[in-house]
C-alpha cells in the first residue's frame, strides 16, 4: 500500500523505530490492562 504523506517528513525517518516501539509498548500496556479487567470481571 502507498506510504502516507507524513512519511516524507524527515521526522518520520528519524523516529520511525522509536515510534513503533512506543506503539508496541502502548499496545502491551493496553493488553495488560484488559487482562486485569477480565480477571476482575471474571471473579
Amino acid at each position: 500500500s502507498e506510504e502516507p504523506p507524513i512519511s516524507l517528513d524527515l521526522t518520520f525517518h528519524l523516529l520511525r523505530e522509536v515510534l513503533e516501539m512506543a506503539r508496541a509498548e502502548q499496545l502491551a500496556q493496553q493488553a495488560h490492562s484488559n487482562r486485569k479487567l477480565m480477571e476482575i470481571i471474571g471473579k
Partner: antibody
Framework: EVQLQQSGPELVKPGASVKMSCKAS????????MKWVKQSHGGSLEWIGV????????FYNQKFKGKATLTVDKSSSTAFMQLNSLTSEDSAVYSC???????????WGQGTLVTVSA | DVLMTQTPLSLPVSLGDQASISCRSS???????????LEWYLQRPGQSPKLLIY???NRFSGVPDRFSGSGSGTDFTLKISRVGAEDLGVYYC?????????FGGGTKLEVK
C-alpha cells in the same frame, strides 16, 4: 505560506497546569509532525517532544515525560501541549515547530510565554 | 545525551566582516543512515528561530549564499562571509542524529 499561530501568554500558580495551542495553516496539517521546544530565560533551547497529527502517536524527550502531554485536534488543525505540576523551572517560552523532508525545525510558531508565580 | 558546545559565546563583529562560529558535539553525530543531521538556526532579537542550514552544509530556501556550513563527525562551523545588520542575533547549532535531539547553547553575534 506555512503559519503556526500560538496562544497567548499564561500566568499560572505553582502546582497548577496549563494548556497552550498551536494552530497550523498554509499546509495539510496531517502531512507533518509537530514538535515542541522550550526556551528558558537564559536562551537555551530544549526539544520536548513530537506528535503525529495523523494518528496521535507521540514521542517525548525523557526529560519531559510526565511533565508535557501533546495532543492534536485534526478538525481545527491545532496542536496542544499541556504542562502539569508547574514549578518556577517551567517558566519559559514554549514554541511549536514543523519540519520538512530535509530539516526538523523549518517553521516555528511565535512562542507562548508561561510564567509560574505565586 | 549528545552535548553540543558552541564557541565563542559572544562574537563582536564589524558590519561587512566575516564571522565564524564553531559547534562541537560530545560524540559523532553521523546517523546510522550515513547522514549527519546538523542544523543551524538564527534567532533575531524578539523573534522565533529561523532555519539557515540543514545536514551540515545545505542552505534552506531563501537563505543568502553568504551563509555556509561545513564540518564532519564532531566538529562543525558556520561562516557568514559579509555580516549585515540583519544577521545579528543568537546562532544555535542542533543535532537530530541521536535521541534526544539537542541544541547548542548559542553564540551571540553583535556589533563591535
Amino acid at each position: 505560506e506555512v503559519q503556526l499561530q500560538q496562544s497567548g501568554p499564561e500566568l499560572v500558580k505553582p502546582g497548577a497546569s496549563v494548556k497552550m495551542s498551536c494552530k497550523a495553516s498554509g499546509y495539510t496539517f496531517t502531512d507533518y509532525f509537530m514538535k515542541w521546544v522550550k526556551q528558558s530565560h537564559g536562551g537555551s533551547l530544549e526539544w520536548i517532544g513530537v506528535i503525529s497529527p495523523n494518528n496521535g502517536d507521540t514521542f517525548y524527550n525523557q526529560k519531559f515525560k510526565g511533565k508535557a502531554t501533546l495532543t492534536v485536534d485534526k478538525s481545527s488543525s491545532t496542536a496542544f501541549m499541556q504542562l502539569n505540576s508547574l514549578t518556577s523551572e517551567d517558566s519559559a517560552v514554549y514554541s511549536c515547530a514543523r519540519g520538512t523532508d530535509r530539516a526538523l525545525f523549518a517553521y516555528w510558531g511565535q512562542g507562548t510565554l508561561v510564567t509560574v508565580s505565586a | 545525551d549528545v552535548l553540543m558546545t558552541q564557541t565563542p559565546l559572544s562574537l563582536p563583529v564589524s558590519l561587512g566582516d566575516q564571522a565564524s562560529i564553531s559547534c562541537r558535539s560530545s560524540q559523532s553525530i553521523v546517523h546510522s543512515d550515513g547522514n549527519t543531521y546538523l542544523e543551524w538556526y538564527l534567532q533575531r532579537p524578539g523573534q522565533s528561530p529561523k532555519l539557515l542550514i540543514y545536514k551540515v552544509s545545505n542552505r534552506f530556501s531563501g537563505v543568502p549564499d553568504r551563509f555556509s556550513g561545513s564540518g564532519s563527525g564532531t566538529d562543525f562551523t558556520l561562516k557568514i562571509s559579509r555580516v549585515g545588520a540583519e544577521d545579528l542575533g543568537v546562532y544555535y547549532c542542533f543535532q537530530g542524529s541521536h535521541i534526544p535531539w539537542t541544541f547548542g547553547g548559542g553564540t551571540k553575534l553583535e556589533v563591535k
